[in-house]
């Protein structure tokens, strides 16, 4: 994938950030040991990775969270990797589900998602979780990225 | 990523190995169905993958472990993917945390880490865990690798 | 990895499908937001990804399942990524193991496998699980794919 000017490498890796927003969409930042290869991929509004070129991308996310079964709803903790293409509805690409831990006050678990998808110019990918307050933002625990094949 | 002589493929996949060392750094071997594309990536001292060329790499690790909540410390099992660049301090790239299982004698869990990072010539990556004695070394359970974009 | 005609991109991402078959090999389909780059990788019999060209491939699988400790055997839930090369025995490339949850009626967990492997022309990869009836087939929960480096 070392390429000439016409086919530059396109890759990103961004780091989770705590947010006061009440949305289920996780927030990310270009901080720590992040990757942003060039302006053909950008982090928009701290919430989505947007690509300028059509093609196949390996997209991944990792989410670490701490939750407790008795204190949570019966539904599991779910992390979803979602796609918004221009002029299209949002759609789910990947999901992972982990039942809450019985550990008190909470038990930590890590989820990893990854897959190869065709993205259109201007397409954005983002990560949804059932409860953002449970997500771990310590160094390296929660991250999100992609690479163009 | 099929490349000419100037841009050879660079990739590695190594297999976990039980060790009598008391270090928290996992040990690896070129055994079984391993991958070592060429001498531009090497396994050093059985513990770290070292690259000769600068660039973006997708680096991953998988760790399966068996632990029990009562027999372990309160802290969760943590696997860390770490980077040591020449003349720099070590740093954590990725971490995953799983609270110990209540299953007896121990409950198995698998962790997967992966992300895109810029590596300098001579940079090494390695995997740390909180308790190496809990790691599963059966075929395919615990492995470590990278590929150059 | 944008390549000329001689080096086309090769990638696949297929979606899990419930099956009445009693085999432990998971079934997949080209449905939903799937990827099949060209005829250099094919889904055969709904169960295996087969490649026409030799080379290094990053192969991955994600399996979400719902199980209960009391209702299951003592053995953990195991997902295995397996390889069948022409004229060779099957072999395990990667495995992950998760002990069954104590949640009732069942607790969901997600497993992710991924690694870089050399494949021969005509080689096939497939995914085995200990109990296919426990696998979640909701949108995005269980998928399987590869990309050629």
């Amino acid at each position: 994938m070392q390429k000439g000017d016409q086919n530059p490498q396109i890759a990103a890796h961004v780091i989770s950030e705590a947010s006061s927003k009440t949305t289920s969409v996780l927030q990310w930042a270009e901080k720590g040991y992040y990757t942003m290869s060039n302006n053909l991929v950008t982090l928009e509004n701290g919430k989505q990775l947007t690509v300028k070129r059509q093609g196949l991308y390996y997209i991944y996310a990792q989410v670490t969270f701490c939750s407790n079964r008795e204190a949570s709803s019966q539904a599991p903790f779910i992390a979803s990797l979602c796609l918004k293409s221009p002029g299209r509805f949002e759609r789910i690409l990947l999901r992972a589900a982990n039942t809450h831990s019985s550990a008190k006050p909470c038990g930590q678990q890590s989820i990893h998602l990854g897959g190869v998808f065709e993205l259109q110019p201007g397409a954005s990918v983002f990560v949804n979780v059932t409860d953002p307050s449970q997500v771990s933002h310590g160094t390296g625990f929660t991250s999100f990225g992609l690479l163009k094949l | 990523m099929q490349k000419g002589d100037q841009n050879p493929q660079i990739a590695a996949h190594v297999i976990s190995e039980a060790s009598s060392k008391t270090t928290s750094v996992l040990q690896w071997a070129e055994k079984g169905y391993y991958t070592m594309s060429n001498n531009l990536v090497t396994l050093e001292n059985g513990k770290q993958l070292t690259v000769k060329r600068q660039g973006l790499y997708y680096i991953y690790a998988q760790v399966t472990f068996c632990s029990n909540r009562e027999a372990s410390s309160q802290a969760p099992f943590i696997a860390s993917l770490c980077l040591k660049s020449p003349g720099r301090f070590e740093r954590i790239l990725l971490r995953a945390a799983n609270t110990h299982s209540s299953a007896k004698p121990c409950g198995q869990q698998s962790i997967h880490l992966g992300g895109v990072f810029e590596l300098q010539p001579g940079a090494s990556v390695f995997v740390n865990v909180t308790d190496p004695s809990q790691v599963s070394h059966g075929t395919g359970f615990t492995s470590f690798g990278l590929l150059k974009l | 990895m944008q390549k000329g005609d001689q080096n086309p991109q090769i990638a696949a991402h297929v979606i899990s499908e419930a099956s009445s078959k009693t085999t432990s090999v998971l079934q997949w389909a080209e449905k939903g937001y799937y990827t099949m780059s060209n005829n250099l990788v094919t889904l055969e019999n709904g169960k295996q990804l087969t490649v026409k060209r030799q080379g290094l491939y990053y192969i991955y699988a994600q399996v979400t399942f719902c199980s209960n400790r009391e209702a299951s055997s003592q053995a953990p839930f195991i997902a295995s990524l397996c390889l069948k090369s022409p004229g060779r025995f099957e072999r395990i490339l990667l495995r992950a193991a998760n002990t069954h949850s104590s949640a009732k009626p069942c607790g969901q967990q997600s497993i992710h496998l991924g690694g870089v492997f050399e494949l021969q022309p005509g080689a096939s990869v497939f995914v085995n699980v200990t109990d296919p009836s426990q696998v979640s087939h909701g949108t995005g929960f269980t998928s399987f794919g590869l990309l050629k480096l």
Epitope: S19, Q134, H137, G138 | - | -
Partner: nanobody
């Protein structure tokens, strides 16, 4: 940086009561729970009680159920532990703990001594 500050510890006779407070300060974006752990001399730190911000649910260690009550004032980012019917075996350093801004935070601890 987020800080947790405990208060309310002290010496009390068996059967007596104490109320501990834990105040969180700093830029707090999200809170999952606030709670208490304790560590008696020569023993491991153990969970006591927790209250979960989103739904007000509470959890207790079996050893304190029916005697201790945890509550919170969300607007002040403060949790309280009302300890009744105290026993000598409740003697310990009590640590406030919280999952704030996506990380586990700890207070410095406050000593509770139950003795006649």
């Amino acid at each position: 940086e987020v800080q947790l500050v405990e208060s309310g510890g002290g010496l009390v006779q068996p059967g007596g009561s104490l109320r501990l407070s834990c105040a969180a300060s700093g830029r707090i974006f999200s809170t999952y729970f606030m709670g208490w752990f304790r560590q008696a001399p020569g023993k491991e730190r153990e969970f006591v009680a927790a209250i979960y911000w989103s739904n007000g649910k509470t959890q207790y260690a079996d050893s304190v159920k029916g005697r201790f009550t945890i509550s919170a004032d969300n607007s002040k980012n403060t949790a309280y532990l009302q300890m009744n019917s105290l026993k000598p075996e409740d003697t310990a350093v009590y640590y406030c703990a919280a999952w704030l801004n996506g990380g586990n935070r700890w207070g410095q601890g406050t000593l509770v001594t139950v003795s006649s």
